[in-house]
Interface confidence: low
């Protein structure tokens, strides 16, 4: 007869593990016993569990309530034996000795491989913020047995770098993901994706990334000139910026106080009906808690009357 | 030796809602990932959802879409808000936890609450 048995068994961790160990013997031939026991390399035989043909299953007290025979019906030729909940711990050699009556002992070994699935951590970087060099955006991190592997997915440009510690029964594996930051990649996703033998699909966590910045600010309302005159209603001047925080904007004259009806409403300064006195330089600050930006305009108000006095000065002059 | 304990529990009408609490004598930072499982009458236990340190979360198909688990490590606290509910979710619930053991090693340190009932009936 011979023993029929599995060169690896691989679990995942927390699953259980069917050890596989069948007699195939002449008729005739009797199992009468078949013993399990730990047989990793340097370590003497540890019994693991007993099957006797009259007496039943005996377990070692270290692994009391995880080792059973699978459920009926049961082949009286078949000694396998399910480890319950598979423990990284429970990785290595096992040895099955099978009895026979009357061909007397065989035995066989296999390899018990635990696959521990890593949970992965994503990890921000500091806080990104236009105009700074090679940063880091986030660090990825995976333990596991065998080693994850871990990459990214993203739109954005950037480099990765990945380092692995390895401890007595699993690996850790570290990703970077560095970008130079840019207004652009302001809300983009930054992927990390694991995967692993022990994953029925890749693991990703995703980072949406923000990134600090200021744009320049300009005053728009001043495209032409002539509609500045005295006498007109509605007029406004419009501060255009934008950023990451959203900034906040503040106007002031340059050469005095705003004039009294000068109305602040954010971004926007609404005049009232205009007169001279509104001429002036005027500032729109923009800020966020990354940056200031000033945009200055000079309003000149036009006078009708004025301009036509000195029309017709000049026509008298000719 | 961390303990944990767990509450919220009690009888609800399908297609209300529980909010499950465990709180933990402990801290839980060093918990590597923390959860619930259930186990109905006659039924073996059964993970419903984990949780990681860095808040990722795993849950079971059963559950997906109704169920959330968040975790405050500020106070040492594992929550499982349990939306729409239905007959099938009756179960004692409990709370696990993990360590890992030295060094980072895969030598899981498991600890469990005493679980706490829910039942879901009109």
């Known amino acids: 007869g011979e023993l029929e048995t599995s060169d690896v068994v691989t679990v995942v961790l927390g699953q259980d593990a069917k050890l596989p160990c069948f007699y195939r013997g002449d008729s005739g031939e009797q199992v009468g016993q078949v013993a399990w026991a730990r047989a990793d390399a340097g370590e003497g035989a540890q019994e693991l569990a007993l099957l006797h043909s009259k007496y039943g299953l005996h377990v070692s007290p270290a692994y009391e309530g995880r080792v059973e025979q699978p459920p009926p019906p049961r082949n009286p030729l078949d000694g396998s034996v399910l480890l319950r909940n598979a423990v990284q711990a429970d990785e290595g050699e096992y040895e099955c000795r099978v009895s026979t009556f009357p061909a007397g002992s065989f035995q066989a070994r296999l390899r018990l491989r635990v696959l521990v699935p890593p949970l992965p951590s994503l990890n921000p970087g500091p806080a990104l913020e236009e105009g700074q060099g090679l940063t880091l955006a986030a660090s990825c991190t995976a333990e596991g047995s065998p080693a994850p592997s871990v990459t990214w997915d993203t739109e954005v440009k950037g480099t990765t770098s990945s380092r692995s510690f390895k401890h007595s029964r699993s690996a850790a594996v570290t990703s970077e993901f560095h970008l130079v930051p840019s207004r652009s990649m302001n809300g983009q996703p930054l992927t990390c994706v694991v995967s692993h033998p022990g994953l029925l699909q890749d693991q990703r966590i995703t980072h949406i990334l923000h990134v600090s910045f200021l744009a320049e600010a300009s005053v728009r309302g001043l495209e032409d000139q002539n509609l500045w005159h005295v006498g007109r209603e509605g007029a406004m001047l419009k501060c255009l910026s934008e950023g990451q925080p959203p900034p906040s904007y503040n106007w002031t004259r340059l050469d005095g106080p705003l004039p009294s009806g000068v109305r602040v409403d954010g971004d926007t300064l609404g005049f009232p009906p205009l007169t001279t006195e509104h001429s002036g330089i005027y500032v729109c600050h923009v800020s966020n808690e990354f940056s200031s930006r000033d945009s200055q305009v000079t309003v000149d108000v036009l006078d009708p009357q004025e301009d036509s006095g000195k029309q017709v000065d000049l026509v008298s002059a000719s | 030796q961390v303990q944990l304990v767990e509450s919220g529990g009690g009888l609800v009408q399908p297609g209300g809602s529980l909010r499950l609490s465990c709180a933990a004598s402990?801290?839980?930072?060093?918990?590597?990932?923390m959860g619930w499982y259930r186990q109905a009458p006659g039924k073996q236990r059964e993970l419903v959802a984990t949780?990681?340190?860095?808040?990722?979360?795993n849950y079971a198909d059963s559950v997906k879409g109704r169920f959330t688990i968040s975790r405050d490590n500020a106070n040492n606290t594992v929550y499982l808000q349990m939306n729409s509910l239905k007959p099938e979710d009756t179960a004692v619930y409990y709370c696990t936890g993990d360590q890992l053991g030295p060094l980072g090693t895969f030598s899981p340190i498991v600890y469990w609450g005493q679980g706490t009932q829910v039942t879901v009936s009109s």
């Open positions: 402990g801290s839980i930072f060093s918990m590597n990932v």
């Open positions: 949780i990681t340190s860095g808040g990722s979360t």
